[in-house]
Amino acid sequence: RKAVLDCEAMKTNEFPSPCLDSKTKVVMKGQNVSMFCSHKNKSLQITYSLFRRKTHLGTQDGKGEPAIFNLSITEAHESGPYKCKAQVTSCSKYSRDFSFTIVDPVTSPVLNIMVIQTETDRHITLHCLSVNGSLPINYTFFENHVAISPAISKYDREPAEFNLTKKNPGEEEEYRCEAKNRLPNYATYSHPVTMPSTGGDSCPFCLK
């Protein structure tokens, strides 16, 4: 009789579909992730099963707490889709599909500087390119550790460009750029390039 009651409950909102989620949705290969399969009903003893496409990854029992499945994303096919099943006696419901986005981390970008020197000004063009990493890549340019550009999004493998005009400075300035894609908390910086102060023939990047 209990099984019948559980199955009847399934047909109402008392036993809705489970929820499958992960704190990390954008991952890189080799990353460990935790997937949480949870259910609104906190009083029932529930058996949770995790699937990826058409393979079974594991089963856990839980009551009141979500089931936690720990995985390592090492191959492209491991992005998903995943789904979890909540089962009580002979009755079950499935979650919606969940997929990770696998992103290759950006490598350190290379900063190139081109300068056109006039008597009063320096017209500076900064180019920044990261040759590896999943697109799109956001580039930001810095002068003396202060951002001087907005984030420039590049959807193809070409350098980001930023132009600025400066009065001929009296002291040297340091430029660098940052490359960042969808991987959270993962940004790389170029080596700094120092622009010498004016005075004498001290503009190695200048177009004469």
Partner: antibody, heavy 119, light 112 residues
């Protein structure tokens, strides 16, 4: 070349044991699932059990307890340990590989090895 | 236990005929489409023809097609060729009582 080669079949007495091997080449068992299937003479195909890329094992109801599937990643080989063998276990035993993340879409098969249980 | 029943168990046909084989499962397969079809010739290992109930496996001629969902599935050969005389099996994947697979009973296609 991707292939599976079974070995270890032969004549065994009722009540005896036998271990079949399935040597995989051209791919890694840490990515693919291997399934054992058997076919008695003149009969249909019968699923025995499966070991997936995570090492999880699954068995047919009738095979549970008597048959055990294991693998050795260093040798890229899967094993089928068969105990308490009976005359009705006489069959050709196949191992087969599934698609990635699809345990039972069996697209690569071994040639099969014959097991005869008789006194 | 899950039952996978194929019908007919055998059939005779001519080259050029349209042939239909059905597979009836006692329970719904996982995802409603975890079903594949295999061809086996005497003394040989089976060969995958169809997966996901209706998707053609690599290298399989387009005269083979599959359909169905849940518990009822069909394999169709639109125009039977001499090399198609063989035995055909369906294979379902299930998660109702553990992660489980079951073959159909088989259908032997012979020359009329």
């Amino acid at each position: 070349e991707v292939q599976l080669v079974e070995s270890g079949g032969g004549l065994v007495q009722p009540g005896g044991s036998l271990r079949l091997s399935c040597a995989a080449s051209g791919f890694s068992l840490t990515i693919y699932t291997i399934t054992w299937v058997r076919q008695a003479p003149g009969k249909g195909l019968e699923w025995i059990g499966t070991i997936n890329s995570y090492g999880n094992t699954y068995y047919s109801t009738w095979a549970k307890g008597r048959f055990t599937i294991s693998r050795d990643n260093s040798k890229n080989t899967v094993y089928l340990q068969m105990n308490s063998l009976r005359a009705e276990d006489t069959a050709v035993y196949y191992c087969a590989r599934g698609y990635v993340d699809s345990d039972w879409y069996l697209n690569i098969w071994g040639q099969g090895t014959l097991v005869t249980v008789s006194s | 236990a899950i039952q996978m029943t194929q019908s007919p168990s055998s059939l005779s046909a001519r080259v050029g005929d349209r042939v239909t084989i059905t597979c009836q499962s006692s329970e719904s397969v996982y995802d409603n489409n975890y079903l594949s079809w295999y061809q086996q010739k005497p003394g040989k290992a089976p060969k995958l023809l169809i997966y996901d109930a209706s998707r053609l496996a690599s290298g399989v001629p387009s005269r083979f097609s599959g359909s169905g969902s849940g518990t009822q599935f069909t394999l169709t050969i639109s125009s039977l060729q001499p090399e198609d005389f063989a035995t055909y099996y369906c294979l379902g994947g299930y998660d109702s009582s553990g992660w489980y697979a079951a073959f159909g009973t088989g259908t032997k296609v012979t020359v009329l």
